[in-house]
């Protein structure tokens, strides 16, 4: 059966300076290959995190995502500012052998909505 | 740099339990998955024991499920592995070793050996 | 179980290939160890099938491909000789495999 991703919220509001938590749980680890989040949709969207042992920034993961058997993928993004605004998308990989990883699912978005102070 | 320092091994008879330790510097030690893997003389390698970062969730193949315990101590940087019952065949040098992301491991102690024999 | 040959030789400068086979892609990553002697210090060379630690010499490279995965070494230098053993972490039984290791001999 095909990995579902799930997006629980439609959109969150967040004051800048504040963090705010988007949620993102998977039924399966399978096919094996590693889960990130974008900001925006096509050619121009931005890597925001990745679950590849990177560090990135005012972003962590919310669960324990070295759990083996570990289904969210959710995360947390501290210090919000204006420029944060926007959809921003968890995304399944396959793993690629020599070509690159190839986007299996993804989940249906999570607008980002900045609020001033 | 990261660092990997296994201590407790030593001689014990057949029967007897043990504990080892693996002391770990050089990187955040309670955002890592750990592992122990050994190695008989004259051996390949065989997997042991995996514990997620927070320590609440422990992995072990059957040849060992029951009988060996993997903990860790997040406060003090320290990984362990109890050793119940040990029989001539545990008989091996034991490492510590951090996981990736995605369970393989990227780091290694160099290893403490230890002997059953009666 | 991971299958890997027993042995491999190769002259300075030639191109080394050691499979490793038995984990199903759809479920598996693998991983490749150096051991210069038995007993002694571990050095992971490949990780995530083809990623190297940044202190390892680009000439080791790694790839995987349906249920084999493949250590290269262009260029294989005397510093070389050691047992290689793949690893491999399989997501659908939460367990981790190593190979049996192979022993490459320069010549």
């Known amino acids: 059966t095909e990995v579902k991703v799930t997006q629980p919220e439609k959109s969150v509001s967040v004051a800048a300076g504040d963090s705010t938590i988007l949620n993102c749980t998977v039924t399966s680890l399978l096919p094996v290959g590693p889960i990130r989040w974008y900001r925006g949709v096509g050619q121009s969207r931005l890597l925001i995190y990745s679950f590849t042992g990177e560090h990135f920034p005012r972003i962590r993961n919310v669960s324990d995502t070295t759990k083996r058997n570990n289904m969210d993928f959710s995360i947390r993004i501290s210090n919000v500012t204006p420029e944060d605004a926007g959809t921003y998308y968890c995304v399944k990989f396959q793993r690629g052998s020599s070509e690159p990883d190839t986007e299996i699912q993804s989940g249906g978005g999570t607008e980002v909505y900045v609020l001033a102070k | 740099d990261v660092q990997l320092v296994e201590s407790g091994g030593g001689v014990v008879r057949p029967g007897e339990s043990l504990r080892l330790s693996c002391a770990a510097s050089?990187?955040?030690?309670?955002?890592?998955?750990m592992s122990w893997v050994r190695q008989a003389p004259g051996k390949g390698l065989e997997w042991l024991a995996g514990?997620?970062?927070?320590?609440?969730?422990?992995y072990y193949p059957a040849s060992v499920k029951g009988r060996f315990t993997i903990s860790r101590d997040n406060s003090k940087n320290t990984l362990y592995l109890q050793m119940n019952t040990l029989t001539a065949e545990d008989t091996a040098v034991y490492y510590c070793a951090r996981e990736t992301w995605n369970h393989l491991f990227d780091y290694w102690g160099l290893g403490t050996l230890v002997t059953v024999s009666s | 179980a991971l299958t890997q040959p027993a042995s491999v030789s190769a002259n300075p400068g030639e191109t080394v290939k050691i499979a490793c086979s038995g984990g199903d892609y759809y479920s598996y990553y693998y991983g490749w160890y150096q051991q210069k002697a038995p007993g002694s210090a571990l050095v992971t060379v490949i990780y995530s099938d083809d990623k190297r630690p940044s202190d390892i010499p680009s000439r080791f490279s790694g790839s995987a491909s349906g249920s084999t995965a493949t250590l290269t070494i262009t260029g294989v230098r005397a510093e070389d000789e050691a047992v290689y053993y793949c690893g491999g972490y399989d997501y659908s039984t939460y367990a981790n495999a190593f190979g049996a290791g192979t022993t490459l001999t320069v010549l």
């Open positions: 514990i997620s970062a927070g320590g609440s969730d422990t």
């Open positions: 050089g990187f955040t030690f309670s955002s890592n998955a």
